[in-house]
Amino acid sequence: EAHKSEIAHRYNDLGEQHFKGLVLIAFSQYLQKCSYDEHAKLVQEVTDFAKTCVADESAANCDKSLHTLFGDKLCAIPNLRENYGELADCCTKQEPERNECFLQHKDDNPSLPPFERPEAEAMCTSFKENPTTFMGHYLHEVARRHPYFYAPELLYYAEQYNEILTQCCAEADKESCLTPKLDGVKEKALVSSVRQRMKCSSMQKFGERAFKAWAVARLSQTFPNADFAEITKLATDLTKVNKECCHGDLLECADDRAELAKYMCENQATISSKLQTCCDKPLLKKAHCLSEVEHDTMPADLPAIAADFVEDQEVCKNYAEAKDVFLGTFLYEYSRRHPDYSVSLLLRLAKKYEATLEKCCAEANPPACYGTVLAEFQPLVEEPKNLVKTNCDLYEKLGEYGFQNAILVRYTQKAPQVSTPTLVEAARNLGRVGTKCCTLPEDQRLPCVEDYLSAILNRVCLLHEKTPVSEHVTKCCSGSLVERRPCFSALTVDETYVPKEFKAETFTFHSDICTLPEKEKQIKKQTALAELVKHKPKATAEQLKTVMDDFAQFLDTCCKAADKDTCFSTEGPNLVTRCKDALA
């Protein structure tokens, strides 16, 4: 229903705490360089204004749209052009063009320093002094680095953060309590970020229909007892929620997400038998829990898929009468039978089925033509299954770090023109798939591996889009989202690449590497590995292993030496010479 004042409506629905959090996230995602204090000031002004509208919906400007109100605030920031360049041009436009202009200027890779966690004692002190400001800083720092982070989910992670600090700051050994717990939240939040970015990419490039197909497949896997009408309703609502968040309508998004959670909990009987535990939780935990709820037990009496979609004499008639509904039903029926498949695979199968019907229904004898369609799915299913087996075997053999290195070599050979920091980031993220998925039961591995890889490769595509350098990457990123992962997997060594000349300074290290945390040490070594491959793209695995072992030995020796500097300056050049020889 229409409200006299949109801002008053959202403030009443969400409550002050969530309202303020969401406005802070919105501002931080739009203007990623502004400080916390600048944004906090704007948030307070918006909140005070919202309260005046709650008191009197007819008060001046209360009837304005949220984008108009927020955009006016952002455009009033001093020195906008100096700090943000052409983003300031957005302020010459009217709504809704202004908002979409802001959205298109969001930076997926802002030049901000990594978010460093203060040491435990300092963290606890500032948390105890002002928990609200502390959590505000968390929202601001995450949102500006992840401008498409799913806003209501970020509120959930802030709540988790809050609970961990409340618990651990009361303990004697704060550090050992905080570190593993906060590391766990950070890991989950980073995965949530790339997954949501993929959803927004899908909406941006391929639209609502593509996202809704993704949602139908995913929901059908999770709720195999829900009927098609129920799944369609949930998919439509979920599409609206995600569209709002991706479009910067964060208050509407959070409000609608809460409504969807409420609907699901009120209709458990027609959705799933697994929802009760989630539904007993408070709002943010409830919505989070529902988003990753375990799959319901599949109905025992499901007929073979072929009955309605291959053997039925009316297949072409049913398809012609309502193409989207018929294909949607196929996707629903296939997905509910295959919780063991990735959503990407299910969408590829639906696409194959559609292409088959398009071709066959125009022929003289359609049933003879489409009769083999299910058998033709086999190679499409085998390819990701083989990918999972090969990569999980490799992960089990090498461990996470070694597996990341294997992926780094592979991807540097596929796209050597891509910057080394991007290759290292991608390989480290892709390599984490082993730890995340390969330890799962067999029937959960494929969906975990492929859907995670797709999300990481989406980030590779976004970074590459900014500065395109590799025709291989451009080719894979230009196709449909569901074909990307198979496209990247199929890439081989880029034969057009002219190897980089060997520069000794690239492989020169100093004693400061010894005091770096393990993660930073790994990144330094992986940077060197990528540079080696760029110098010798056709180096064998054995050659690269020899060099990397030598390199690791050199670091170990010099970091243990009494005079580290001398060791690095004398042994370093010898290492470089040995590397050149080994790769000659």
Epitope: P96, E97, E100, L103, Q104, C200, M203, Q204, K205, F206, G207, E208, R209, A210, K243, C246, H247, K323, D324
Partner: nanobody
Framework: EVQLVESGGGLVQPGGSLRLSCAAS????????MGWFRQAPGKEREFVSA????????VYLDSVKGRFTISRDNAKNTLYLQMNSLRAEDTAVYYC??????????????????WGQGTQVTVSS
């Protein structure tokens, strides 16, 4: 393929009204979002209004809100733009456009795959 043909443009005095029509033919079931854009001489193409064919949700440029109304007739496969209280600054060529995928950014012309040839609207006394 979707074909779009606009009509209804013309010369009108300030404060007057016009109703633009856009007839869609071809595979119109896929025309998921339809929009009106306009282009004044020497300016870039500007978003005016859009409607979701499926659920009728609408959106407008701030300066036309309350004066222009977008609507569609599913049976006739036709999109309309009722323009009231016209001003001199509304003078432009008006284009009808279709985005079969209903992509996220609805004010971006590149997101619309199909375009009509345009109809001239002149507001002058």
């Amino acid at each position: 393929e979707v074909q779009l043909v606009e009509s209804g443009g013309g010369l009108v005095q300030p404060g007057g009204s016009l109703r633009l029509s856009c007839a869609a033919s071809g595979r119109t079931d896929s025309a998921y979002r339809m929009g009106w854009f306009r282009q004044a001489p020497g300016k870039e193409r500007e978003f005016v209004s859009a409607i979701n064919w499926s659920d009728g949700r609408t959106v407008y440029l701030d300066s036309v809100k309350g004066r222009f109304t977008i609507s569609r007739d599913n049976a006739k496969n036709t999109l309309y733009l009722q323009m009231n209280s016209l001003r001199a600054e509304d003078t432009a060529v008006y284009y009808c456009a279709a985005d079969p995928d209903s992509r996220l950014y609805y004010t971006v012309p590149q997101n619309y795959d199909y375009w009509g040839q345009g109809t001239q609207v002149t507001v002058s006394s």
